[in-house]
Structures are given as structure tokens and as C-alpha cells.
């Protein structure tokens, strides 16, 4: 069971300082941006991180949403990352959900975050280069010190 708590507005970056944004095709991508680029590209660079109470404490349970014309929420259904047009629900009556991720700091580094899927144990949000694009993907990872699964989250509230 997950019960919604508060939400916060955040900018998410990979460890190469590239900013996560949602492009016109609704794809989550990372790109080099100055602070002013980041502001100019809002709301596509501003993510709503909603925190949830978890009936089985396993870290901070969150959803990641973005509000452009409508609210879309990040999903890892079938291990594929996509934004689905939906509001983060108030309650989820299950111990796993394709839209719930566990946000945890990297040991010894409170500013570096990992996001593990609640649906797929050992699968993490990651930044992966594909041709010329830096994409947000779900990655099965047993190399937990890999920088591709680490992010910084900067609160914008």
C-alpha cells in the first residue's frame, strides 16, 4: 500500500550535470543546459516528485511527474520508461507499482540519488547514450557504483 504525502518541484540532473527534460515527443532526455536554459525550458525541466508513505518501509517511495499541457507520470511498465498521461494517485493498493520508485541516497553521498523500481527489484533509472541522445531508461544493474544510475535532485520550491 502506498499513500500520497507531499510533493515538491525539482530539477533532476545526471552526474555529468545534464538536465532531465521531457521533449516534444514526451521522451525523457538529458541535455547540457545553463541555468537560464533550464528556466527557459520550464515546465519541461521541472519535475513534480510526489512522496508516498509505504506500508513496507523500503526507502522514500516517489512518483515523478511533469506538467506541460497535462500531467504525465513516469512509468516503467514492462521495463520500458515512458510518461503516461495521469495524475499521481492518492493511494495505490499494492506493494509494487510501475509508477513508484524508491529514491535513496548513495551511501556517504547525501546529494547523489538512485531510483529503484518498486516493480522490478534491482532495476534502476539510468542515463544511457543512444546515438546522439542521452535517454532516461530502466536498467538492470548489479554495479551499484555505476555513475549512470546516480542523479542529483535540486528542489525548486
Amino acid at each position: 500500500y502506498f499513500g500520497k504525502l507531499e510533493s515538491k518541484l525539482s530539477v533532476i540532473r545526471n552526474l555529468n550535470d545534464q538536465v532531465l527534460f521531457i521533449d516534444q515527443g514526451n521522451r525523457p532526455l538529458f541535455e547540457d543546459m545553463t541555468d537560464s536554459d533550464c528556466r527557459d525550458n520550464a515546465p519541461r525541466t521541472i519535475f513534480i516528485i510526489s512522496m508516498y508513505k509505504d506500508s513496507q518501509p523500503r526507502g522514500m517511495a516517489v512518483t515523478i511527474s511533469v506538467k506541460c499541457e497535462k500531467i504525465s507520470t513516469l512509468s516503467c511498465e514492462n521495463k520500458i520508461i515512458s510518461f503516461k498521461e495521469m495524475n499521481p494517485p492518492d493511494n495505490i493498493k499494492d506493494t509494487k507499482s510501475d509508477i513508484i520508485f524508491f529514491q535513496r541516497s548513495v551511501p556517504g553521498h547525501d546529494n547523489k540519488m538512485q531510483f529503484e523500481s518498486s516493480s522490478y527489484e534491482g532495476y534502476f533509472l539510468a542515463c544511457e547514450k543512444e546515438r546522439d541522445l542521452f535517454k532516461l531508461i530502466l536498467k538492470k544493474e548489479d554495479e551499484l557504483g555505476d555513475r549512470s544510475i546516480m542523479f542529483t535532485v535540486q528542489n525548486e520550491d
Epitope: 518501509p57 535513496r104 529503484e116 527489484e121 551499484l144 555505476d146
Partner: antibody, heavy 126, light 107 residues
Framework: QVQLVQSGAEVKKPGASVKVSCKVS????????FHWVRRRPGKGLEWMGR????????KYAERFKDRVTMTEDTSTDTAYMELSSLRSEDTAVYYC???????????????????WGQGTLVTVSS | DIQMTQSPSSVSASVGDRVTITCLAS??????LTWYQQKPGKAPQLLIY???KLQDGVPSRFSGSGSGTDYTLTISSLQPEDEGDYYC?????????FGQGTKLEIK
Amino acid sequence: QVQLVQSGAEVKKPGASVKVSCKVSGEISTGYYFHWVRRRPGKGLEWMGRIDPEDDSTKYAERFKDRVTMTEDTSTDTAYMELSSLRSEDTAVYYCTTWRIYRDSSGRPFYVMDAWGQGTLVTVSS
Amino acid sequence: DIQMTQSPSSVSASVGDRVTITCLASEDIYTYLTWYQQKPGKAPQLLIYGANKLQDGVPSRFSGSGSGTDYTLTISSLQPEDEGDYYCLQGSKFPLTFGQGTKLEIK
């Protein structure tokens, strides 16, 4: 309790290949990997590589990558490690081990080598 | 590759002594460090994971500490059955690397 049972000792000639098996018995959760580690006489533990039974993807230590092949047969829950072009320095005890997630009180994941096979002595001698 | 420098390579101590073994990583390994004990003719056994978390069934005289690049295994009061070889292993990045090992002997 998971147990790993390895194949028996082998004596091989230089230049030959050896294939060591590692069978899982007992209940094992998903999301684990098989790793292979060896210990040469008078030396320390040395990591050789790992295989993911879910998709058969492998990662090998650089010094073995041209000579080692790790495979897995999900139907029999058995992992295999084949080492080719054997030389006397490959005389060692070879271990298989499972690599899986343990969690701390906040749910943070840590991979550990928890279950180990009994070891297989491979002797390379002319 | 991440290098793990373990010291001492051997130690001889008496029953009841406090024994400390250290591992120094060549880069930050984020506490993705495990400690193993190996006795002659046996497979290694997990003692500590996540740098400081005691594996179930391991006596509480064993403890681990450290973060970043510096890690320590401590045996607070040495017992005869603690004789054997001890290894640290970094699990942060591939290739995984063990320390060179520490041979612990009871005087």
C-alpha cells in the same frame, strides 16, 4: 537454504580446456547472478567474471576474457565456467557463488556473494 | 580498475586480542564493500556487507566500518576459531576486486 554443488576435481594438460559446473539446489529467488572466483595455491581470491541467468549477459575480468566462457542452463539451474588454453598457472580451486541483493534497514541495496560452491580443484600439469 | 590494498598481509595474535584489518580502495566505493573469512579447504564465508552490516549468524565480535576509500574489519576479542584468511571485496564497479588477503594466526 540455497546450496551450490560443483563438479569434481579435474587434471588437465597444458593447452586443454576445462568446464566446471555449479548446480543450485534449494529455493533461490530471482534477481541473482552467478560469479566465478578462483584461488591459486599460496595466492588470494581472484574474481573471474559473472553471468546473469535472466539474459545470459556476462562480464569478465580483463585477464580472462579471451579464455573464459560462462554459461547457464535455466532448465537445470546449473551454471558453467569453461577455461581454455590452460597453463600451469591456472592450477587453482574454482568457486561459483551467487551474487544477490541484501538490504539495510532503509531498503538500500547491497550485492553480496552469499552462497558458495564447495570448490573444484583444477590441476594443470604435463 | 579499482585497486584494493589490504593490510597487514599476515597477523599473529592471542586469544582475547583485538585485531584490525584495513582495506584502502583506489577510489570511492560508496560502502559497497564486503568482508569474507576463508578457512583451509573451505569456501569463503560472508562476514560483513555494506561496509558495516553483520551477516546473520556471524558473531558480534566481528564489526566493519569505513566509507569512501577507507575500510576496516575489527575482531574485538579473538577466538581460536577465527584463524584463517580474510578478504575485502569491492562491489562498486566491475571488474570486482579483492584485497590481497590477510592470514590471521593464533599465537
